[in-house]
Amino acid sequence: LVVTPPGPELVLNVSSTFVLTCSGSAPVVWERMSQEPPQEMAKAQDGTFSSVLTLTNLTGLDTGEYFCTHNDSRGLETDERKRLYIFVPDPTVGFLPNDAEELFIFLTEITEITIPCRVTDPQLVVTLHEKKGDVALPVPYDHQRGFSGIFEDRSYICKTTIGDREVDSDAYYVYRLQVSSINVSVNAVQTVVRQGENITLMCIVIGNEVVNFEWTYPRKESGRLVEPVTDFLLDMPYHIRSILHIPSAELEDSGTYTCNVTESVNDHQDEKAINITVVESGYVRLLGEVGTLQFAELHRSRTLQVVFEAYPPPTVLWFKDNRTLGDSSAGEIALSTRNVSETRYVSELTLVRVKVAEAGHYTMRAFHEDAEVQLSFQLQINVPVRVLELSESHPDSGEQTVRCRGRGMPQPNIIWSACRDLKRCPRELPPTLLGNSSEEESQLETNVTYWEEEQEFEVVSTLRLQHVDRPLSVRCTLRNAVGQDTQEVIVVPHSLPFK
């Protein structure tokens, strides 16, 4: 097989057109991603076969492997195959897309694997990171394949810099199945304890009659041995349990507790580990942030959520304007605190069909005998705007005035507009905005008042029209963050006797 150009690696320009030719003594074909792209096949007079693949309007997504192979039923040797790798540097393409299959790497043994993050430009510097860390891992990179090495059972991402922006790849997950005929599980009554409390761990083996347990734990390393107790769980066949009990834990008992189980008949073994943390005293810690100003919309329901970690389990109270809240019998307020993991809690305050009176200063307090934390925020009730009044008058001065009054929270904006051609506006022609400083024929005066009791703003705006020479449709639109409302009135010139 003869390939032109020969490669084995080409770097082509984005948006360009490029021709690849392959020829051989039998029919030949170009393959890309296990498929045959459109190509021109021919047979010359001297019996040589060829295939021409024309790549047009190249993009970064054309980066990858191209193969030329014999397309023949005579079964020529399978190694008669030429590989070409094309790069099309394209700043709009970060990492080449992966199939879902490539994002999950499954192993049963320790073996070299490739994390297939590939870029379009062979000049780019690519680094590999654990998903949770910033430090680049010392793993060799091949621009055509990705990072190859022996990887732990973790998640990884690749990073590169294109121009001045840092680009991350999708996350790759390495799953290693520890093949074992022994099924061991380890659990603890609690994985967090205070000093002086007890640590109790259980290691359970399923499906084996004769096993040997060996525990490794922080105390053992200092020569202070604890005798585990082994028993059979009679309600289940071949469930054997080893219990490790450490009374009155000390800070030094924090660490990894490993249960190693061996079965001598087939020489199988398995081990599982669990981390135990001994804390000096209990704690309560807020997780994440809740802004000091929260919003709810009138008559809608709103749930306010606080996430925190605590040990031992805390008491949680909610306050509004320093008064304790409880679940209301009318179902207007619901409080719930749920344990989402051993030491993590989510506390929620749900206001059902929010009322204006529920605006105010809210505090959640979580506490136990060792620690407490509190979080406060102001709740603002947003009220959709409504136009309450739109009236027109024409005082003796000769000018005509239109007054618009409306309310809402947060403060509404007011927009005045007019249609001079009543037949065509607003369907065919857009309304004209009024009240701009450049417009001499109209003047605007707007006053805003905050009503403390109703906790909303009132806007009163007066539009003065200097001379109206034909009927005019004047529209007042009020807008705020949660809605808008519009009313319109027809203003008729003084000279017309009717309204």
Partner: nanobody, 116 residues
Framework: QVQLLESGAEVKNPGASVKVSCKAS????????IQWVRQAPGQGLEWMGW????????HSAQKFQGRVTMTRDTSISTAYMELSGLTSDDTAVYYC?????????WGQGTLVTVSS
């Protein structure tokens, strides 16, 4: 302690369907994708597909499309994988697995035997 507990072994006739369950505990069920993987006798691991327990979205490997259905019941933190049109080539240990970012967790495996 994250744990995945799978249902027991099954023997099926060719052409039948099998439904394997995977009960998760020790973590918020909706937090991590559930993967389904199988291992036929003497073969390596073969990825079948994933399930997003939060949304119920799934994605299966091309080989299994149209034959595999992945579902979940969040109220009992359980994922299910149903494989239809069984043949003897589907005899394998079926695993569910999940990844917490810093390590993977596996079910104990469910042996499915297809024979007439």
């Amino acid at each position: 302690q994250v744990q995945l507990l799978e249902s027991g072994a099954e023997v099926k006739n060719p052409g039948a369907s099998v439904k394997v369950s995977c009960k998760a505990s020790g973590y918020p069920f909706s937090a991590y994708y559930i993967q389904w993987v199988r291992q036929a006798p003497g073969q390596g691991l073969e990825w079948m597909g994933w399930l997003n327990p939060n949304s119920g979205d799934t994605h299966s490997a091309q080989k299994f499309q149209g034959r595999v259905t992945m579902t979940r019941d969040t109220s009992i933190s359980t994922a299910y994988m149903e494989l239809s049109g069984l043949t003897s080539d589907d005899t394998a240990v079926y695993y569910c697995a999940t990844h917490g970012g810093d390590r993977s967790y596996w079910g104990q495996g469910t042996l499915v035997t297809v024979s007439s």
